[in-house]
């Protein structure tokens, strides 16, 4: 999708639905692209992103990507279509209301990614193991 500072022409008349056939509406996500971050060794972090946007496409969800290498830590916040890979990974948890970070294998860095389907859910990124799929809040499927 497009970052907040880039404009684009959008004319698409499809009705987008989720897996259950319900009409999918766009949602509000933090959208700062890549920023340096101080989030490290914490159970959860706030994004510290001051830019909120309505995703351009109804099917898009909120995504956060946390990366750490020898030099710095960055946090990326965007809207993205879960049907398409992001950073070569599938967004498995796109229906979750919370952004639960999962580690992905990337050479030369520590790489965590999460996606979620409630407004501004990528503002609070969760690393803690206590939030797992047995948490009833994660079983809540949200279409906003």
């Amino acid at each position: 999708t497009i970052p907040p500072h880039v404009q684009k022409s959008v004319n698409n008349d499809m009705i987008v639905t989720d897996n259950n056939g319900a009409v999918k509406f766009p949602q509000l996500c933090k959208f700062c692209d890549v920023r340096f971050s101080t989030c490290d060794n914490q159970k959860s972090c706030m994004s510290n992103c001051s830019i909120t946007s309505i995703c351009e496409k109804p099917q898009e969800v909120c995504v956060a990507v946390w990366r750490k290498n020898d030099e710095n830590i960055t946090l990326e916040t965007v809207c993205h279509d879960p049907k398409l890979p992001y950073h070569d990974f599938i967004l498995e948890d796109a229906a979750s209301p919370k952004c639960i970070m999962k580690e992905k294998k990337k050479p030369g860095e520590t790489f965590f990614m999460c996606s979620c389907s409630s407004d501004e859910c990528n503002d609070n990124i969760i690393f803690s193991e206590e939030y797992n799929t047995s948490n009833p809040d994660l079983l809540l499927v949200i279409f906003q």
């Epitope: 497009i2 909120t52 946007s53 409630s118 949200i142 279409f143």
Partner: antibody, heavy 116, light 110 residues
């Protein structure tokens, strides 16, 4: 069927307070963010406030910041708007609406009149 | 003064096509999806278009929306007397951190 029913409007003096409620039914209230939008008599729509599904995130229009407080009780399927230090320019029909990216359902509105 | 600019009025005859414009800036329409709302006299607003060009179920395909750059527009084809209403565009403003509406356009069917 999705229904939003506002209540709590009425006549109040400048400087006074009111608490509006919005009772939701027909959908899983705790899964949706909610908003308040108002419309002064004969004027256009003005967004007032928004609250996330789990009330972690709230936003307010500059015109009400510091005076109005949005809250929700998911166990009661109810949205609230606490309005303090009311001014004449707050006179309007107040609507609660579902979501923020697109207000897909609206209540019928409750009239708030601020006058001495 | 509204953040989004709409013409205060528009008119057309039955069967005609009418377009209502909505102009904003890079912090609102330029970077956020736009919605359109219809408000019939004495009633609450109703969602007409979301995500720039998508229609909720139940909205006739005579209504269509589009967006380009920092402007959006609502087109109504095959105008009918029941389309006489106020129309509002709306979107998030990433600079103001709030939702913004246009001033509204009163559509008259002559």
């Amino acid at each position: 069927e999705v229904q939003l029913l506002e209540s709590g409007g009425g006549l109040v003096q400048p400087g006074g307070s009111l608490r509006l409620s919005c009772a939701a039914s027909g959908f899983t209230f705790s899964s949706y963010s909610m908003s308040w939008v108002r419309q002064a008599p004969g004027k256009g729509l003005e967004w007032v406030s928004w609250i996330s599904y789990n009330d972690r995130s709230v936003y307010y229009a500059d015109s009400v910041k510091g005076r109005f407080t949005i809250s929700r009780d998911n166990s009661k399927n109810t949205l609230y708007l606490q309005m303090n230090s009311l001014r004449a320019e707050d006179t309007a029909v107040y609507y609660c609406a579902r979501r923020i990216a697109a207000f897909d359902y609206w209540g019928q509105g409750t009239l708030v009149t601020v006058s001495s | 003064q509204s953040v989004l600019t709409q013409p205060p009025s528009a008119s057309g005859t039955p069967g005609q096509r009418v377009t209502i414009s909505c102009t904003g800036s890079s912090s609102n329409i330029g970077s956020n999806a736009v919605s359109w709302y219809q408000q019939l006299p004495g009633t609450a607003p109703k969602l007409l278009i979301y995500a720039n060009s998508h229609r909720p179920s139940g909205v006739p395909d005579r209504f269509s929306g589009s967006k380009s750059g920092t402007s959006a527009s609502l087109a109504i084809s095959g105008l009918r007397s029941e389309d006489e209403a106020d129309y509002y565009c709306g979107t998030w403003d990433s600079s103001l951190s709030g939702y913004v509406f246009g001033g509204g356009t009163k559509l008259t069917v002559l």
